[in-house]
């Protein structure tokens, strides 16, 4: 139903606390450089305005769209041009163009210092002084670094953060209580951010159909007992919610997400028995619980897929009459039977099936043409299975750090034009997938690996789009969302790349490396490794092993020496010469 005042309607639905949090997230995601105090001032102004509209929905400006109200607020900031440059040009546009313009200025990689965690004592002091302000600061710091973070989920993590502090700030050993809790929240929140970013990229770059297909596959795996019609209903609502959040309409998104959770709880009998434990929880926890829900057991006695999708003489007729419904049904039926497959695999299989029907249904005897379709789709299953098996074997053999090094070499050979820090960052991220997934049972390994890789490659693609350096990366990123991972896997040494001239600076180390934390030490060594590959992209595995071995021995020797700097100064050039000889 239409409301006289949209902002009053959302204020009433969400309540003041969540309303203020979402307004703060909205502002922080769009105005990533502004200080916290400025945002707090604007949040209070917007909240006061919303309260006035609740009191009188006919009051001046209360009938305006929320996006317009936000745009007007932003455009009224006096320092907008000097702080944000050309973002201020958006203010000359009319909505909805102005909204689109703001969206295009969101920065996925803002030049902000890492979000450092203060010492537990300092944390607790600040929290006790003013816990609302403290949690507001958390929302602000996360939102400005993650401009597409799923806003209602961020409210959930802020609640978790608040609960951890409430409990641990009373503990005798605050650090022992807080550290594991905050580490767990951080790790989960980072994954949540990456997942939402992929959803937004899917909608923005590949369209609604791509996102809906992704959702059908995921929900069919989670709720295999639900009918296709029920899955379709949820997917339609979920698409609306996701579009709203990706578009920056966070109040609408959070409200509609609440509605979706309510709908699912009211219809849990026809969706999943696992919903019971979620539906008794309060709003934020309920929606989060549904998002993270364990998959339901498969219904027994499911007929063979071939019955409806190969043997049935009506396949082409059904395909012609309602292509998307028929393919959606195929994806649903396939996904609910295969919870162990990744979303990417399921979508590639559905795409393969669609391509086969496109070809066969145009023939005089379609059935003869598509009769062996499932045999022909088998490579789409075998390829990722084999890849995961090989990579997990390598991970088990080398450990996380060694596996990251192998990936650093592999990805530098694939895209040597990419900057060294970026290659190291992605090699490390890709390597950590081994830690996350390789220890899992066989049935979960495949989906874990490919689903995580999709998140990492999406981030790579987003940053590469901002400053493109490699045509091959652009091609893999833009041609097809579901084929990104296979596309990157299929890249080998870039034959067009002209090796980088040798710079001794890239391989010169000083005593300060000895005192660095282990992680930073690894990063320094991996930077040198990447530089080495850029210098000799076709070096053999044996040559690389030798050089890395010499390098590790050099670092150990000099870091153990009494006069470390002298050792680095004297032995460094010798090591460089030896490496050059090995790689010659």
């Amino acid at each position: 139903e239409a409301h006289k005042s949209e902002i009053a309607h959302r204020f009433n639905d969400l309540g003041e606390g969540h309303f203020k949090g979402l307004v703060l997230i909205t502002l922080s995601q769009h105005l990533q450089k502004s200080p916290f105090e400025e945002h707090v001032k604007l949040v209070n102004e917007v909240t006061d305005f919303a309260k006035a509209c609740v009191a009188d929905e006919s009051a001046q400006n209360c009938g305006k769209a929320i996006a317009t109200l936000f745009g007007d607020k932003v455009c009224a900031i006096p320092s907008l041009r000097e702080t944000y440059g050309e973002l201020a040009d958006c203010c000359a546009k009319e909505d909805p163009d102005r909204v689109e313009c703001f969206l295009q200025h969101k920065d996925d990689n803002p030049n902000l210092p890492p979000f450092e965690r203060p010492e537990p004592e300092a944390l607790c002091t600040a929290f006790k002084e003013n816990n609302d302000r403290f949690i507001g600061h958390y929302l602000y710091e996360v939102s400005r670094r993650h401009p597409y973070f799923y806003a209602p989920e961020l409210l959930y993590y802020a609640e978790k953060y608040k609960n951890a502090l409430t409990e641990c700030c009373e503990a005798a050993d605050k650090a022992a209580c807080l550290t594991p809790k905050l580490d767990a929240i951080k790790e989960k929140a980072l994954v949540s951010s990456a997942q939402q970013r992929l959803k937004c990229a899917s909608l923005q770059k590949f369209g609604e159909r791509a996102f809906k297909a992704w959702s059908v596959a995921r929900l069919s795996q989670k709720f295999p007992k639900a009918e296709f019609a029920e899955i379709s209903t949820i997917v339609t609502s979920l698409t609306k919610v996701t579009k709203e959040c990706c578009h920056g309409d966070l109040l609408e998104c959070a409200d509609d997400r609440q509605e979706l959770a309510k709908y699912m709880c009211e219809h849990q009998d026809s969706i999943s028995s696992k919903l019971k434990e979620c539906c008794v929880k309060p709003t934020l926890q309920k929606a989060h619980c549904i998002l993270e829900i364990q998959r339901d057991e498969l219904p027994t006695e499911l007929p063979d897929l071939a019955v409806d999708f190969v043997e049935d003489k009506e396949v082409c007729k059904n395909f012609a009459e309602a292509k998307d419904v028929f393919l959606g049904t195929f994806l649903y039926e396939y996904s609910r039977r295969h919870p162990e497959y990744s979303i990417g695999m399921l979508l590639r299989i559905a795409k393969g099936y669609e391509a086969k029907l496109e070809k066969c249904c145009a023939e005089a005897d379609p059935h003869a043409c598509y009769a062996k379709v499932f045999d022909e789709l088998q490579p789409l299953i075998d390829e990722p299975k084999k890849l995961v098996q090989q990579n997990c074997e390598l991970f088990d053999k080398l450990g996380e750090y060694g596996f990251q090094n192998a990936l650093a070499v592999r990805y530098t050979q694939k895209a040597p034009q990419v900057s060294t820090p970026t290659l190291v960052e992605y090699a490390r991220k890709l390597g950590s997938v081994g830690t996350k997934c390789c220890s899992l049972p066989e049935t979960e390994r495949l989906s874990c690996t490919e689903n995580y890789l999709a998140l990492i490659l999406n981030r790579l693609c987003i940053l590469h789009e901002k400053t493109p350096v490699s045509e091959r990366v652009t091609k893999c990123c833009t041609e097809s969302l579901v084929n990104r991972r296979p596309c990157f896997s299929a890249l080998h040494v870039d034959e067009t790349y002209v090796p980088k001239p040798f710079h001794a600076d890239s391989f010169t180390f000083h005593a300060d490396i000895c005192t660095l934390p282990e992680k930073e030490k690894q990063v320094k060594k991996q930077m040198a490794l990447v530089e080495l590959v850029k210098h000799k992209p076709k070096a053999s595995e044996e040559q690389m092993k030798t050089v890395m071995g010499d390098f590790a021995a050099f670092l150990k020797k000099c870091c153990d020496a009494d006069n470390k700097e002298a050792c680095f100064t004297e032995d460094g050039p010798k090591l460089v010469a030896k490496c050059q000889a090995t790689l010659a």
Epitope: K313, E314, V315, C316, K317, F319, A320, E321, E358, C361, A362, E363, A364, D365, P366, H367
Partner: nanobody, 115 residues
Framework: DVQLVESGGGVVQPGNSLRLSCAAS????????MSWVRQAPGKGLEWVSS????????LYADSVKGRFTISRDNAKTTLYLQMNSLRPEDTAAYYC????????SGQGTLVTVSS
């Protein structure tokens, strides 16, 4: 919505000819092979003939081979069945279908061959 409208049926004497048409709409006609099926009074559906989307490939049931010719006009999104040397056993309701489907979508057109 997909629509298939058959026409051209009638009553003819054995040995005579008829040309059936099927006007198709609501789907990408050129992307689909099309078929003719028929149903004699009191019998099940029987496949008669099929043609590929481009019109280059055709298939016929043994009972009509050499007598019937299937064709299509993709510009007009219309399917045809030219029936020569008709026999009493060709008496049936004729339906055009998408792909190799053996179900009726349109209303069909009745062909009666009798002396």
């Amino acid at each position: 919505d997909v629509q298939l409208v058959e026409s051209g049926g009638g009553v003819v004497q054995p040995g005579n000819s008829l040309r059936l048409s099927c006007a198709a709409s609501g789907f990408t006609f050129t992307s689909f092979g099309m078929s003719w099926v028929r149903q004699a009074p009191g019998k099940g559906l029987e496949w008669v003939s099929s043609i590929s989307g481009s019109g280059s490939d055709t298939l016929y049931a043994d009972s009509v081979k050499g007598r019937f010719t299937i064709s299509r006009d993709n510009a007009k999104t219309t399917l045809y069945l030219q029936m020569n040397s008709l026999r009493p056993e060709d008496t049936a309701a004729y339906y055009c279908t998408i792909g190799g489907s053996l179900s009726r979508s349109g209303q069909g057109t009745l062909v009666t061959v009798s002396s």
